[in-house]
């Protein structure tokens, strides 16, 4: 009876279990009743990092110097290239696909410390009573407007991203 499931590092095809290709190799042809799975090593600038049945290897990531990127670790047939940013610059994400001089603080956060040549911007969440409605690399959280000092009342509460909205006091009718 043909198998319905295969062991680890195997795959099911044409009612039989074939060996997967090892990392660094791609599939050329599936196994048959008489032959083993045929695999070939990935090319120079290619890789596959898992046991697989891929017919094409993945291209190594390109660390584009025009984006401020450089190679941190050269790729192998089993691993992708790892990029990093030029000295003094910071990756925009874990994948490091582009570089910024320093990060900015999103709405709801203020700048605690402006970036220097050796340290990135330090952001802090705006506490209750303060807000920031912009992305910035220098602006702190701003205090909510004090409606009372303008002889007004709060019509809409503030948040960490928005100021309070002030309005006129309700006059009592005689």
């Amino acid at each position: 009876e043909p198998p319905t499931a295969c062991r680890e590092k195997q795959y099911l095809i044409n009612s039989q279990c074939c060996s997967l290709c090892q990392p660094g190799q791609k599939l050329v042809s599936d196994c048959t009743e008489f032959t083993e799975t045929e695999c070939l090593p990935c090319g120079e600038s290619e890789f596959l990092d898992t046991w697989n049945r891929e017919t094409h290897c993945h291209q190594h990531k390109y660390c584009d110097p025009n984006l401020g990127l450089r190679v941190q670790q050269k790729g192998t047939s089993e691993t992708d290239t790892i990029c990093t940013c030029e000295e003094g610059w910071h990756c925009t994400s874990e994948a490091c696909e582009s570089c910024v001089l320093h990060r900015s603080c999103s709405p709801g956060f203020g700048v605690k410390q402006i970036a220097t040549g050796v340290s990135d911007t330090i952001c802090e969440p705006c506490p209750v009573g303060f807000f920031s409605n912009v992305s910035s690399a220098f602006e702190k959280c701003h205090p909510w407007t004090s409606c009372e000092t303008k002889d007004l009342v709060v019509q809409q509460a503030g948040t960490n991203k928005t100021d309070v909205v002030c309005g006129p006091q309700d006059r009592l009718r005689a």
Epitope: T92, S136, E139
Partner: nanobody
Framework: EVQLLESGGGLVQPGGSLRLSCAAS???????EMWWVRQAPGKGLERVS?????????YYADSVKGRFTISRDNSKNTLYLQMNSLRAEDTAVYYC?????????WGQGTLVTVSS
């Protein structure tokens, strides 16, 4: 495509003044915080001054406070840096930059040399 074109640099004597300009295109200038950043020969990048999108709030590094003034004209898509009482240590290439400071969005800069 974002383009930032700095101009106004040159050779000036200590105590002199210069006004740098940065012409911006390829993005909505009035929506962005803008910065002036400089790089002295053989040194790293130093953040000099910044201005919020509306031009109502500014930041200055301690080294230039009271001497430099940042401003912007959103109708002309232009950023300015008025530099007074220039010192030898202000010698650098000056760049304007927009948030979020992508490497590939920087201009060529303008060279300011302060020397007698």
């Amino acid at each position: 495509e974002v383009q930032l074109l700095e101009s106004g640099g040159g050779l000036v004597q200590p105590g002199g003044s210069l006004r740098l300009s940065c012409a911006a295109s390829g993005f909505t200038f009035r929506d962005y915080e803008m910065w002036w950043v400089r790089q002295a020969p053989g040194k790293g990048l130093e953040r000099v001054s910044a201005i919020n999108p509306q031009g109502t709030r500014t930041y200055y590094a301690d080294s230039v406070k009271g001497r430099f003034t940042i401003s912007r004209d959103n109708s002309k898509n232009t950023l300015y840096l008025q530099m007074n009482s220039l010192r030898a240590e202000d010698t650098a290439v000056y760049y304007c930059a927009k948030l979020p400071f992508y490497f590939h969005e920087w201009g060529q800069g303008t060279l300011v040399t302060v020397s007698s």
